[in-house]
């Protein structure tokens, strides 16, 4: 572990999504115990949850969280004002929209208030930690006798998202998937009118506004085609 102490106006830079530092200690004590890693996710740029595994502590400890933005106008150290709890022990912090600045380096510091030298600091690139809400309002319409077009909406700027469409018929064992760019539109060129199709979509904050790895939840599925499929064992599992 790197033992550089980060201050709000420090000049350290990193290209990683996070960078962990801990306080050095002179003697073996409770302060040598590593603090849990903080994981932050920004939900649709409406709020952010930064959480840690509170059960990893040897005894129940209300760890405290501070944060700031490195090399920016928002470099003043802030205390968490809205803790999340797990069995009455702090396990996270929720930040509201006005406290989220995507393209500045977010620095989060976890501390044991009973042992102030025991602290860990991470630097995060929030634009790589955005998780959008699931796509909504899926609609299907026929472009021709055998061609279907799937459209959907996102509660976010379209150009910041890419999408993954999955579809299958009631005869298929697995999903077929197709990547779709910010245009949020998918065409299926040949549809079998005798089969029932199911479509679903998820979205990701990538690659134009960030490099997030996490996908949204799947949308509610939408169906198209024959409702009857007597010999098919997959249909009911699909709808469950």
């Amino acid at each position: 572990l790197n033992t550089t102490i980060l201050t709000p106006n420090g000049n350290e830079d990193t290209t990683a999504d996070f960078f962990l530092t801990t306080m050095p200690t002179d003697s073996l004590s409770v302060s040598t115990l590593p603090l849990p890693e903080v994981q932050c996710f920004v939900f649709n740029v409406e709020y952010m949850n930064c959480t840690w595994n509170s059960s990893s502590e040897p005894q129940p400890t209300n760890l405290t969280l501070h944060y700031w933005y490195k090399n920016s106008d928002n470099d003043k150290v802030q205390k968490c004002s809205h803790y999340l709890f797990s069995e009455e022990i702090t396990s996270g912090c929720q930040l509201q929209k006005k406290e989220i600045h995507l393209y500045q380096t977010f620095v989060v510091q976890l501390q044991d208030p009973r042992e102030p030298r025991r602290q860990a600091t991470q630097m995060l690139k929030l634009q790589n930690l955005v998780i959008p809400w699931a796509p909504e309002n899926l609609t299907l319409h026929k472009l021709s006798e055998s061609q279907l077009e799937l459209n959907w909406n996102n509660r976010f700027l379209n150009h910041c998202l890419e999408h993954l469409v999955q579809y299958r018929t009631d005869w298929d064992h697995s999903w077929t998937e197709q990547s779709v760019d910010y245009r949020h539109k998918f065409s299926l060129p040949s549809v079998d009118g005798q089969k029932r199709y199911t479509f679903r979509v998820r979205s990701r904050f990538n690659p134009l506004c960030g490099s997030a790895q996490h996908w949204s939840e799947w949308s509610h599925p939408i169906h198209w085609g024959s409702n009857t499929s007597k010999e098919n064992p997959f249909l009911f599992a699909l709808e469950a």
């Epitope: 393209y103 634009q127 990538n206 690659p207 134009l208 506004c209 490099s211």
Partner: antibody, heavy 119, light 107 residues
Framework: EVQLVQSGAEVKKPGASVKVSCKAS????????MHWVRQAPGQGLEWMGH????????NYAEKFRSKATLTADTSTSTVYMELSSLRSEDTAVYYC????????????WGQGTTVTVSS | DIQMTQSPSSLSASVGDRVTITCRAS??????LNWYQQKPGKAPKLLIY???RLHSGVPSRFSGSGSGTDFTLTISSLQPEDFATYYC?????????FGQGTKLEIK
Amino acid sequence: EVQLVQSGAEVKKPGASVKVSCKASGYTFTSYWMHWVRQAPGQGLEWMGHIYLGGGATNYAEKFRSKATLTADTSTSTVYMELSSLRSEDTAVYYCARSQPYYYGMDSWGQGTTVTVSS
Amino acid sequence: DIQMTQSPSSLSASVGDRVTITCRASQDISNYLNWYQQKPGKAPKLLIYYKSRLHSGVPSRFSGSGSGTDFTLTISSLQPEDFATYYCHQGHTIPFTFGQGTKLEIK
């Protein structure tokens, strides 16, 4: 201080290519988009495309899709725009301009590079 | 593509006047509307972003309003340095597009 410095004026013959550079300084290069905007003589502003410097993804307006190619060198904080198959209609001032993705405007602009296409 | 239509195309006014320039989008762009000022031979400068947020260093006499498809740039009291061409720009949908510009001249 944020600065975008573009390469100098170019005179090219029809059919040739030109590569315009835009060197950025004074900010974290990879947190931004770099846009390219064209302004023909006496005309308005026309958005050509942009590149996300945090990952290299690009997007173009349809009319520039086969005309312009955007690339970036993060080691030198420089963005390049190459224009191919030049025609007299490509004579214009070309600006690079940075913006944070999402809803921020283009808050810093290069000084502009004049490209003249003439036989 | 989203068309941005500015009006008027040109405008004559005097120092101290209150001036309004409008911009209409061909479809809903929410609040993703920016305004720029450009003087002859110079690069454009950002004035207003996200419909109404004043860019740092821009005088408070500039303000933006509107939403959806109709937007307004207002200069509350014209100063000599405000005579320039103004452009609106939508950042909602790729390809991003500019209005055709409004030239503000001295009366």
